[in-house]
Amino acid sequence: KSPVFGPQEVSSVEGNSVSIKCYYPPTSVNRHTRKYWCRKGASGRCITLVSSEGYVSSNYAGRANLTNFPENGTFVVNIAQLSRDDSGHYKCGLGINSRGLSFDVSLEVSQGPELPNGTEVYTVDVGRTVTIKCPFKTENAPKTKALYKKIGQTSVLVIDSRNYVNPNYKDRIRLRIPGTGQLIFTVVIDRLRLSDHGLYLCQAGDGSNRDEKNADLQVLEPEPELVYEDLRGSVTFHCALGLEVANVAKFLCRVNSRETCDVVINTLGKRDSAFEGRILLNPQDKDGSFSVVITGLRKEDEGRYLCGAHSDGQLQEGWPIQAWQLFVNEESTIPRSPTVVKGVAGGSVAVLCPYNPKESQSLKYWCLWEGAQNGRCPLLVESQGLVQEQYEGRLSLLQEPGNGTFTVILNQLTTQDAGFYWCLTNGDTRWRTTVEIKIIEGEPNLKVPGNVTAVLGETLNIPCHFPCKFSSYEKYWCKWSNTGCQTLPSQDEGPSEAFVNCDENSRLVSLTLNPVTRADEGWYWCGVKQGHFYGETAAVYVAVEEKKVAGSRYVSPAKADAAPDEKVLDSGVREIENKAIQDPRLFAEEKVVADTGDQAGGSRASVDSSSSEEQGGSSK
């Protein structure tokens, strides 16, 4: 018997579509071999109609396709606009039609149900609204208008113009009679239920002169849309439920084993703790549509999701819904990166952010997830240089190491920095990832003066002590600006006394500014890195004042003041609009903070070429 498997019989009606899924053993040979859908003729030959190599026969042109899913060992043949001529015997298979692996499929296309002449067909999703149009003649204008539902041989009154409403339709149906001259009345049914499905009859007047019109109402429960996303990646559910529920509370829920639906997030402020730090419900548009983004996808996120609208913020029968089936692919293209990064108060973290390597030119962003209400993620930094004012001097986004990873460094950590952060770009939204920063007990490894006042025209020497464990790392000093951190020349000065229990490899790296200029004022970072991986950083603020006493100035930790908690920016610097992320396309609207410090110029502070390429990594 053939190892290929599929539906033995497929039946449908004219004008409809079918989707035929065929399964095959997913060996490497099978995954890459030709897939086909062919029709068996009287001669026994099987004529190809569509294949995975792009062939589509003339009578399938524009209405059929074949998609291979090698990771699942399936391929799907979609055929639209079916006609009765499509009825027949087919094969789905692999390899060559005549001697490959195949499965026989019988397709039967029928005319569809016989409906009374002139019947209007209304096809509407459950929970939505239908408007049934009922024409009448002038002589029936003053007479009673009514809508009946045909159940078997009987007709049950649903609504009429004498204010009768069938209890099954209470509070969700209305009959509208237009002004004079318009010979049509309408019946509007809201929040359609599956039980509303069936044949209806409009009637105006009575006796032999009455006007009648048949309406076939087909109420469909939306079948789940299939969504395949990668482990560790991101999924966006776009939910458009219609204007009728634009002002009603919205929700996303996940169907559980009891067939009820657990709220994942809603607009009333409810959120499932399993999605803490990795979910946003983006504000709805005027048309009532909204979207939910979930990042850091896990295998256990798989399942059926429904979005809907109801004043309670949860699923209720007869209200509109949309459905998705989420599959999380474990063979992910998104590389593993730490989901939790730990730092100590006063210390730093370096976070690795993956992005689609095909989109190296995309803008990169980092935002802070906030859980209030529907969740939001105000941007903190972006690759073009925008940095939130309160992060000045302690946050930088680096393009390195490149090739699918960028790095974000945050230093001068406080307990307030603990939380969830998102890495994202203005490109492939599926590569949004989440990292949690935790502040733990401990001391920073790098020691720099708290803050420094330099004298104009003199020499300034800033020491940075590092422990022996960093002896093999590359050390650097850089001058921070909101567009990055420009590397400066620095020198190793041998052993340091800052670490008592350390061998001779404990060292000091210092930065010398000679002579100090006004442009030198600003934030400086001392850091370590190893190949592609950035390690810890420490920041020091240098203020420049007028010359008072001649001579050079050497700053040691003993003389240093405490680091300022926050530098007050010039009043001319505009604050960044604290805008939550909704769509990366909106990022361009962010206001950019003016550069608070020019890069030090001249030969005094040339860029250390060894540090511009091989960077990246994460310090835990």
Epitope: F5, P7, V10, L220, E221, E223, P224, E259, R304
Partner: nanobody, 129 residues
Framework: QVQLVESGGGLVQTGGSLRLSCAAS????????VGWFRQAPGKEREFVAA??????????YAADSVKGRFTISRDNAENTVYLQMNSLKPEDTAVYYC????????????????????WGQGTLVTVSS
Amino acid sequence: QVQLVESGGGLVQTGGSLRLSCAASGRTFSVYRVGWFRQAPGKEREFVAAVIWSGASTYKYAADSVKGRFTISRDNAENTVYLQMNSLKPEDTAVYYCAADPLGLPGPDVRVEGGYRHWGQGTLVTVSS
């Protein structure tokens, strides 16, 4: 919760016929797929037949061992799925289980037990020689 109740099992002679019924009740969501599985004494549960419906289209599946002998069908109005079993053989002796799931075409392989969220208690079919 969706409840599934099987009926129609019994004792039949080789070559005889039986019709099994699977009635669904209490469903919160529409069921889009129903499968029949069987478990013979001392053996693992195996796939027999399944039906998926999507809009106006219906897809029927059958295991090689029952092709041409067993037919699956459904009665929409009654919320019932039937398994018509003809030309029965002693090797068809087993407890027959009905399974259902709200996931239709997008769902997993119909032959996989994990593709069904709801199961009935089973009905015994004995084919004597």
